[in-house]
Each structure stands twice: as C-alpha cells, then as structure tokens.
Interface confidence: low
C-alpha cells in the first residue's frame, strides 16, 4: 500500500515519540517564513535549512529536529537530519519532502526555513594556455609585511597543496562538504578538481605571484570538481571556522568566499554572525553581469564584496556576461588574466579571470593591512580599503545606466604605507535598496554597527520624492527616504563615518511656512553640524527658493524650503571641526558638484533649494553631487538654479593621536 506521498512501498506507522506529545505551539502572532532561491535551476528541493530563533540552545535544536522527524513519520514520511547547526546560527539541515514544509514552519522555535541551493566558483575559464613561471626582478613587488600575523581561510575546491607557489603556506583542513558532480560519466581529474582553489590560494599568498606572501592559509572544500557547492555546505564550512576560532583563538582571521549563489537569507545571516565575531569576510561579487544584491554572499552587508576590473581599469567581460555591479559591491580589484598557480603541475602557472580572482586580491590586501594593524575592526578595514582605492578610474558606461550611480568607482590598491592612516576621518557612502513606486514607499540606508551616520540624503530618478530624514531605529540612527505620489521610487543615501567617542543627535525644525524658509542649527555646546536633511509631506514643494547664503557666524545652520521640515545632524567628538562649502550655479545644470579640500572629509551633502526638479544629492568619495532634471524639461531659468552644499570635517584629535604614535 502506498502512502499519500507515494514515496514508500509500504506504509508503516511510526512509533509515538516521547516528545511528540509536547507539541508546543509557536509563539502567538509569530509566523515562520519559507524562502527559496529565485533562480530555479539553482534550487535543491528536498533539502532544507531550518533556522531557529536566535536564543535557541543546541538541545532545543536537536529536540525540534526530532519532533519534526516524529511528526513526519506519523504521516508516513521519512526525514533525515543531515546536520544540527550551532556556533553561528541555531537550526538544522534536513532531507525531507516539500509536503512537510507547512508542518515544519509550525514547529516551536522556528524562525524561517530556506530550501538549499547551489553556489558556484566565480572564475572563467578554468584552464587557459599554460604559461612559464614569471621571472621577477629584484625591484618587483616586495611588500614589507606580507600578512604573516593573519590566517586566511579559503572556502573553495580542493587544492594542490604541494604546488611550489603555496607549499608550506596552505594547510588543508579535513573539512569537506560538496555535492556530487553532475552527470553520470563525470570523470574526476585531480588537476581539474584542484584548479580553482589552487589558483586563488596562489593569488592570496603565492611565493611569486601572491599579494600577501607571508599570509598562512587554511582550505575548506565546499566546491566540487565542477566548481559547484551548496548553501548548506558553505554554512557548515562557516560554522567550522567559527568553532575553530572558539576552540583555538588566533590572530586576525580573513575568510575568502570566491563563490556565489542566488540571494540567500540564511547564508547572509551566517556571514553577519561571523563578521560580528570579528572575522573579515571577502567575497566575489559574481560573474553574472547583474546586480550583486541578487546573489549571496555578495549581498550580505557585513561582507566585503569585490567586483572585477582589468589592467585598463575597465569592468571585466566574461564571455557574454561579466562582473556584477551595484550598491552591494564595495570595490573592484584586478580580475582579468590573473597569473597564478596552476594545478596541472607543481611548478605550472596559468591565467584565470573572474570576481573570485578580484576577491582574492582584496583578501591579500586585507591580510597585509591586518598584519600591520591587527586591532583593526571590520569597519575600519573596509573604510581603509575604500580610502586607499584608486578613484573614478572605471568606465561606468559598461554598467547599465540605472546602476552607474549605485556602483562604487573604486579599484583596490595597497596603501602607500601600512601605518600612519590613523589621523584620517574615514567616511563612505551607503545606498539603500530601491523603495519601489508606491505612494508611501520608503527606503532605508544603514551604517555598520561601529560607524556613525553623519548625514542622510535621497535620490529619485523621476524627481518625485518627499526628501529624507534621520531617525532612530534599534538604538541607532538610520537614513530614511520618502517616495512621492507618481514617483518611480527613491534611494536613501547614508554617509557612514568612523568617529571614535562621537555623540551625535538630530535636531529638527518643522515647516516654517515663512517666506525665509525653514532653519535649524546645532545649539548644544561643542556640537558641530555634519549633515542636513529635509523632508516634506506636500507632493510638490514648488519653486520657492530660500536664501542660499547663511548669515555670517552661523555655519552650524541648515536651511531649507518653508514647507519642509529640516533635520540637522549634530555631533560632538574630540577635536571634530566642520565647515560648510557651497557651489551654486545660476543657470540650469543637470549636475552641480562641490568637493572638500585635501585633509578634509565630506560628511554631508545636500541640495538647495529642495524643489521638485532636484533629483537628489549624494556623496561620491569627497565630492557632493547634486543632480537635477534634464534642463530641457525644467521651465524657467530661475527654477533651474541649484546649489550643492557640502559639509567638510576633520578631526584634530585623530591627527594628534597619529603624530604621537610616530
């Protein structure tokens, strides 16, 4: 007799589990959710990661897994618990019929369930013509400190650990979690199996062609001989690293994830946990010529996501595809025809291309920076990577038009000196996801936990927006942008800075309705203005133009439209000083910019006036950019006049601290 699933030859009722009677209902009002990969061919139905609520203990995870098995067996279904997670995320990996999902979602402690999916190595092609080992001159790249204090974990294919480039530098762990190769006649060949991982290990720490020649590496096998792995296998690998870190704490850890799959909530969550445990994660943006936010782990905010450029600093094209792009990319790095160790023989070299190679470069740079300054936090490291990058060298025409403004024009570079950057006030720009077009839609941009939100701006391609405001969320300030009726959606743009011992607050002035416009200033003693935002409820602010120039002696003042509420970001930090810099153009102009001088860092960027023909304002490196509608569509010349307002800051405290160290 067949059961309802048609899965077994005979139906045998399961013995009642001693725990099956304890069927606790999930907490009232909470509903667990189900997630699966948006890219259908990458789905792996039949295997599910059941993620439990954050505070769930291992014993509760095991009990929940057993309860699922018992309840499934009573319905005539077989299930198999493949792994119980603890250390990073509580939960378990289960092989079961999709028919059981509804049952599983109702189990106690369940937060969400994700169907397993594939991840892939991000290098193309795997084997080009073999080249002779490059000969290096004595004056070639010889870094002073090759990352010797740092351990780099590589989650990839198997590797040829006896290759002369990496021999003695890479420890192959006993970790292996890979799916079987596709196809019934797949023939495993060691050199092919090891190709991807060996090359990347060489790029990171190779004797001749490595970035961080002193870094030691540990390899975990999560990709099979075809360069394919699973989200679940990668999760177990990340958990293995966390457990290793807990059992035997070492110096700074860098984890290189040269792989990508579809967007995965659980993989991003695991990366977030590991990052918050002090591990630096570097990943490939993906080779799909697509928005990196649609892929994981590239879309995890805590991960350093790397796109690929070539020797001419152009985005890398890979066949019909190429490097991913967009707001989830942190920076780009060399990723075309990169010379590295070939697994064809122990002295062979080969060239490979892809965002995997780009990520390996950044992992190497990170290892060197951390070796020079082991106490650097993830936020500090990311800011330094951005700060020392080559700016505005990438030809943005390669990217889709709507992605150009969102994609960082940064190519990773080693700092000229690994020490002495401490005096700098570091800031970066963080774009939100698109709000969507509904009338009340909003978009939120957030800074990393140990960064300060110093200003908030917004941008809409249609110009239909209702501004932005800084607001508290979970004890931290976030930047929220508001869409307007008929608008296609908005972006929120946060300016996130490293400002030790900062005390920041937001001062708000409601709409003034007076002809002079709305004003707000930082009135607390010792607080300086770092950013201005404006938000309005009306659909169209009209053409009222407030005075652009501030009264003398009032540098700490934000001014705006009389129908808008104005928000001033006011900060107190040791030695912090800021100044307002404006650039106004009387004639209509699609783009107006103003930059901070050398030694000053852009913290705030806004537009005057806040009228509807202004698309928005955003910071690009140290330049404030204000965009307006196409001048041919704006009516009068007076309405076309726009001023870009930059707030430039520096920290005398950081400068002094740096001098004392030298």
């Amino acid at each position: 007799q067949e059961d309802e699933d048609g899965d077994y030859e005979e139906l045998v009722l399961a013995l009642r589990s001693e725990e099956d009677g304890l069927a606790e209902a999930p907490e009232h009002g909470t509903t667990a959710t189900f997630h699966r990969c948006a890219k259908d061919p990458w789905r792996l139905p039949g295997t599910y990661v059941v993620v439990l609520k954050e505070e769930t203990h291992l014993s509760q995870s095991e009990r929940t897994a057993r309860r699922l098995q018992a309840q499934a067996a009573r319905r005539g279904y077989l299930t198999k618990i493949l792994h119980v997670f603890h250390g990073l995320l509580p939960g378990f990996l289960v092989k079961m019929s999709g028919d059981l999902l509804e049952l599983a979602l109702k189990l106690p402690h369940v937060d969400y369930i994700e169907e397993d999916s594939s991840v892939f190595a991000q290098s193309i092609p795997w084997n080009l013509e073999r080249i002779t080992p490059p000969r290096y001159r004595a004056d070639e790249y010889q870094p002073p400190d090759g990352g010797s204090l740092v351990e780099v974990y590589l989650l990839d294919t198997s590797i040829q650990s006896d290759h002369r480039e990496i021999e003695g530098r890479v420890m192959v762990t006993d970790f292996e979690n890979v799916p079987e190769e596709d196809g019934t006649r797949f023939h495993r060949q060691a050199s092919k199996c090891d190709s991807h991982g060996t090359h990347l290990a060489g790029v990171v720490s190779g004797r001749d062609a490595g970035v961080a020649k002193g870094a030691s590496m540990r390899s975990l096998r999560v990709l099979n001989c075809q360069g394919k792995g699973t989200v679940s296998g990668t999760l177990i690998g990340l958990e293995f690293i966390r457990k290793s870190q807990l059992v035997q704490p070492v110096g700074p850890l860098v984890v290189l994830l040269p792989l990508a799959g579809g967007y995965s909530r659980v993989l991003n969550a695991a990366c977030q946990r590991l990052a918050r445990a002090g591990v630096v994660l570097v990943t490939a943006a993906g080779n799909f010529r697509d928005d990196a936010c649609l892929y994981s782990p590239a879309s995890a905010p805590e991960v350093i996501t790397v796109g690929a450029t070539n020797a001419q600093d152009q985005p890398v094209t890979l066949g019909t595809l190429g490097t991913n792009f967009g707001r989830c990319v942190d920076l780009f790095a060399p990723g075309e025809d990169i010379i590295g160790a070939s697994s064809d023989c122990s002295t062979c070299f080969v060239s490979q291309s892809g965002t995997s190679q780009a990520a390996a470069h950044v992992a190497g740079i990170a290892a060197m920076m951390l070796s020079a300054e082991p106490e650097l936090t993830l936020a500090e490291l990311r800011q330094r990577l951005i700060h020392f990058s080559a700016k505005d060298v990438i030809n943005e025409a390669w990217f889709p038009e709507d992605q150009r403004v969102l994609t960082p024009n940064l190519v990773a570079a080693l700092p000229p000196s690994t020490h002495g950057a401490g005096w700098q006030l570091f800031c970066r720009t963080v774009w939100s996801a698109h709000s969507g077009p509904t009338r009340m839609a909003t978009a939120v941009a957030r800074c990393a936990p140990d960064e300060e939100l110093l200003s908030c701006s917004s941008f809409s391609r249609s110009g239909k927006r209702r501004g932005e405001r800084m607001e508290a969320q979970g004890g931290k300030l976030v930047c929220r942008a508001h869409n307007a009726f008929g608008g296609e959606g908005v972006y929120a743009i946060a300016r996130c800075c490293l400002l030790p011992q900062a005390n920041c607050s937001v001062h708000t002035a409601p709409p003034a309705e007076a002809s002079m416009g709305t004003r707000v200033h930082c009135h607390q003693q010792g607080h300086v203005l770092t950013g201005c935002s404006s938000h309005w409820e009306v659909e169209d602010l009209g053409t009222h133009k407030p005075p652009v120039l501030r009264p003398r002696g009032q540098p700490n003042q934000c001014v705006g439209h009389r129908e808008a509420s104005i928000h001033a970001s006011c900060c107190h930090a040791p030695g912090l000083e800021c100044k307002v810099k404006e650039h106004g153009i009387p004639a209509p102009q699609e783009q107006v910019t103003v930059a901070c001088e050398e030694g000053w860092t852009l913290t705030g960027c806004s537009a005057l006036p806040g009228t509807s023909h202004v698309l928005g304002a955003y910071a690009v490196d140290n330049t404030c950019v204000v965009r307006s509608r196409d001048v041919s569509t704006t009516g009068s010349t007076s309405e076309g006049a726009v001023t870009a307002v930059a707030i430039c800051c520096r920290s005398r405290h950081l400068a002094q601290a740096s001098q004392e160290l030298q």
Partner: nanobody
Framework: QVQLVESGGGLVQAGGSMRLSCAAS????????LGWFRQAPGKQREFVAA????????YYADSVRGRDTISRDNTKNAGDLQMNSLKPEDSATYYC???????????????????WGQGTEVTISS
C-alpha cells in the same frame, strides 16, 4: 527500518568474475540510491558504485569503471554488482547501502547512506 543482506562473495582467481547481490526488505523508500562500498583490512570504507531508482543512471569509482556493472530490480527490491577482470587489490568486504532520501545525483560518501548490510567477503587470489 530497511534491512539489507548481501550474498555472492567468496574466493576467485585474478582475472575472473563474480556477481554480488543485495536484497532489501522492510520499509524501503521508492526513491533511493543503492550503493556498493568495500573495505579492505586496515583501510577506510570506499565507494565502488551507485545506481538511481530508475536503473538507467549509474556511477562508478575510477578504480572499477569499465570492469564493474551495477544493476537493480525494483520489483524485487534487489540490486547486483557484476565484477569482471578482478585483481588482488579488489579483495575486501563488500557492503551494499541505501541512501533513503538523496540530496545529490549520486552519493559516494559513507555519511550519506542510512542503511548498511553486514557485508560479504571477496578474496581474489593471484
């Protein structure tokens, strides 16, 4: 619970052939991988061959590819491993195993398999 019983082992000359059989009983799933593994004294258990439920999809270890043939009869819940051109290094205890809910195309790792037979000994004399 699935019970697996192997048969057909014994002693054979190098270059000869042998057929091993595996009979499954109990709560056998409709969709499962039937695999054969072997373990020589003092060595780890290693994958030999596997077959999917349809019988048309098979997978072999490099060491036996071209010499061995795996087959199964779903109506009888049984599977066979035909071994040809046997070598002394093929001597081992052979186990049949079932992966009751496959997550992958083929399972070659011991940890994937849920049920195991007791094993049958195969000795190849030179």
């Amino acid at each position: 619970q699935v019970q697996l019983v192997e048969s057909g082992g014994g002693l054979v000359q190098a270059g000869g052939s042998m057929r091993l059989s595996c009979a499954a009983s109990g709560r056998t799933p409709r969709h499962y991988i039937l695999g054969w593994f072997r373990q020589a004294p003092g060595k780890q258990r290693e994958f030999v061959a596997a077959i999917r439920e349809s019988g048309s999809r098979t997978y072999y270890a490099d060491s036996v590819r071209g010499r061995d043939t795996i087959s199964r009869d779903n109506t009888k819940n049984a599977g066979d491993l035909q071994m040809n051109s046997l070598k002394p290094e093929d001597s081992a205890t052979y186990y049949c195993a079932v992966d009751q809910y496959p997550t992958t195309e083929f399972s070659t790792q011991v940890g994937h398999y849920d049920y195991w037979g007791q094993g049958t000994e195969v000795t190849i004399s030179s």
